[in-house]
């Protein structure tokens, strides 16, 4: 039902959902710190623009008694319960930040009259695509899918001379929230990825994965999985791997690969890691000092959510426009704003654009090296290392089907 918004007369409130069930197991205190740091920046920017207004955040906590799984499994009801709590207290702000779980975002979007914008650090699933008042500040599954299709089709690079049309996808159900939805998108029979591939099989058991590594009758040389190097090692160990196997390890929110002293373990030599660009590193910033590489992206998305709201508020106030209108709710897309770590671009559907980076392990240096980058905004691949020191024959990626000639 319609809830009055605390969003006028020079006072603008942000409702931040602090849910027990979250895409990443981040202490809520750290998210509060990120939000508060964002508020300080927004207040400064508004003041500099000569806008004498008040911006505050209200943190809405769920009781944690019923919904205490800690992951996203019971988030659907928790999100709706929190909305009910907001409704009963008549405490809705100009914008809702959170939730991060796909289930809860989807349900909240469905069950409410969304005349206010919703900003999410997460909501990775395809079911949250193309939502008119939803903005997602962490790369959603759709962006990953578009990269993979683009990369599979590429056949004109010195190191990739074959188009691929096949793949195995390893998905055992124990994935983190981001990985769950990324793999879910690849598995879905109606998705763009499935539509563009001629063959795709999901491997659900460890043994299935392990058997494929040396199976002469395998239908594809390419296996996509999601997680970190340790996750791969647990599964693969030191098993022998056929020389034309390529494992694509999706590990978007982990910038450890770019740290100076990191050496790639031997079991990573058949692996291409897909991660996000480190951008202008946040390692030394006050807000990120106590966060792990993955958590940094999550907390940063909360902080950037606040900065995005500040950006939109400034534009609407300068134009003398009302904040509590559908126009405001639908405006959080197709724009660039000053994020904490430089400009952040949102696409036509309010989803963050980024640069994905494909890394390989150099057989010479045992270091991770950038093979290519992919700009989600223009759906374009940029080769970086034209003569990679691969483990694969002739320093070229193999064909996806053993024994098949040039495509």
């Amino acid at each position: 039902s319609q809830v009055s918004q605390n969003c006028h007369n020079g006072s603008y409130e942000i409702s931040v959902l602090m849910m027990g069930n979250s895409a990443f197991a981040e202490p809520l205190k750290n998210l509060e710190d990120a939000v508060n740091e964002g508020l300080e920046i927004v207040r400064g920017r508004l003041q500099n623009a000569g806008l004498n207004v008040t911006v505050n955040a209200t943190f809405m906590y769920s009781d944690g008694l019923i919904h205490n799984s800690g992951d996203c499994r019971s988030s659907t009801c928790e999100g709706l319960d929190l909305l009910r709590k907001i409704s009963n207290a008549q405490r809705m702000g100009c914008v809702l930040i959170g939730p991060s779980c796909t289930y809860s975002t989807f349900q909240m979007y469905l069950d409410t009259e969304l005349s206010y914008p919703m900003i999410s650090a997460g909501s990775f699933g395809l079911s949250c695509d193309y939502k008119e008042t939803l903005t997602r500040l962490m790369s959603p599954a759709r962006k990953l899918m578009y990269f993979l299709v683009n990369f599979w089709k590429t056949n004109d690079l010195p190191f990739k001379t074959y188009s691929w049309s096949t793949s195995y996808v390893y998905k055992n159900g124990t994935e983190t929230e981001d990985c769950f939805w990324y793999l879910n998108a690849l598995e879905a029979s109606v998705s763009y990825f499935s539509h563009e591939l001629g063959f795709k099989v999901v491997l659900r058991q460890d043994k299935e994965f392990q058997d494929i590594l040396m199976d002469h009758n395998r239908k594809s040389n390419v296996i996509i999985m999601c997680g970190g190097p340790e996750f791969l090692y647990k599964l693969k160990g030191d098993r022998a791997v056929a020389e034309d196997i390529v494992i694509i390890l999706v590990d978007l929110f982990n910038d450890q690969y770019f740290e100076d002293n990191v050496t790639a373990p031997d079991y990573m030599k058949n692996v291409l890691v897909l991660t996000l660009s480190p951008g202008n590193s946040l390692l030394n910033s006050s807000f990120s000092r106590n966060l792990s590489p993955t958590k940094r992206d999550f907390a940063l998305a909360y902080l950037n959510g606040i900065l995005l709201f500040g950006h939109m508020l400034k534009i609407f106030l300068e134009n003398g426009e009302n904040i509590t209108t559908p126009k405001f709710a639908h405006a959080f897309r197709n724009l660039t704003f000053e994020g904490y770590d430089g400009p952040v671009t949102l696409d036509d559907w309010g989803d963050v654009d980024s640069t994905m980076v494909l890394l390989y392990t150099s057989v010479d240096t045992k270091k991770y090296k950038v093979l290519l980058t992919y700009d989600t905004h223009v759906n374009k691949t940029y080769p970086v290392d034209m003569s990679p020191t691969f483990t694969w024959k002739n320093s070229k990626l193999p064909n996806d089907i053993t024994g098949r000639g040039p495509q």
């Epitope: 724009l335 980058t373 700009d375």
Partner: antibody
């Protein structure tokens, strides 16, 4: 506050080369691209090329391909632009400019810090 | 290469006037359009990036709009410091290209 300081004015003979330096201070050099832009007397701005750290190599406008070389020395936070086979129409002010590019892409958000410019005169 | 065309190439205006300069790209550049101001004898300075974002420290009388191929720079109330040459520039792909410039002179 980031500053770009360029080397001093040069007078060159046709057919010779010129090398202009651009030293950055007060910021992270490798987090940005450096572009070189020139402006002939009374004319508009012309992008010559730039160097983006992640790609390592420089990119050049077709017009200058083969004549211009852009390099960067991260240890001294200095970028260089060398133009060879000079002709009288190369007489111009040459600017270096910090370019806020998108990491791993060629898209950018503008050139937000400029050097003071280096006047290069080509005359026999 | 993407061609950038500015209009007018020069104009006369008075202090307090509202000034509009347009820039057209030969193909769609999304919102990757930047505006620069160049005072005589000085290096250019960035005013607006990504079509409509005001660069830090730039007065709010400057604003930008547009996407695709057509863009506008507006100065809501011209000040004495604003008599200069203005350039648009696309930064979606290499080579980055500039418009030919618009000179704003005192009427």
């Amino acid at each position: 506050e980031v500053q770009l300081v360029q080397s001093g004015a040069e007078v060159k003979k046709p057919g010779s080369s010129v090398k202009v330096s651009c030293k950055a201070s007060g910021g992270t050099f490798s987090s940005y691209a450096i572009s070189w832009v020139r402006q002939a007397p009374g004319q508009g701005l012309e992008w010559m090329g730039g160097i983006i750290p992640i790609f390592g190599t420089a990119n050049y406008a077709q017009k200058f391909q083969g004549r211009v070389t852009i390099t960067a020395d991260e240890s001294t936070s200095t970028a260089y632009m060398e133009l060879s086979s000079l002709r009288s129409e190369d007489t111009a002010v040459y600017y270096c400019a910090r370019t806020r590019y998108i990491w791993g892409s060629y898209r950018a958000y503008g050139m937000d810090v400029w050097g003071q410019g280096t006047m290069v005169t080509v005359s026999s | 290469d993407i061609q950038m065309t500015q209009s007018p190439s020069s104009m006369s205006a008075s202090v307090g006037d509202r000034v509009t300069i347009t820039c057209r790209a030969s193909q769609s550049i999304s919102s990757h359009l930047n505006w620069y101001q160049q005072l005589p004898g000085n290096a250019p300075t960035l005013l607006i990036y990504y079509a409509s974002n005001l660069q830090s420290g730039v007065p709010s009388r400057f604003s930008g709009s547009g996407s695709g191929t057509d863009f506008t720079l507006t100065i809501s109330s011209l000040q004495p410091d604003d008599f200069a040459t203005y350039y648009c520039q696309q930064s979606i792909s290499l080579p980055y290209t500039f418009g030919q410039g618009t000179k704003v002179e005192i009427k």
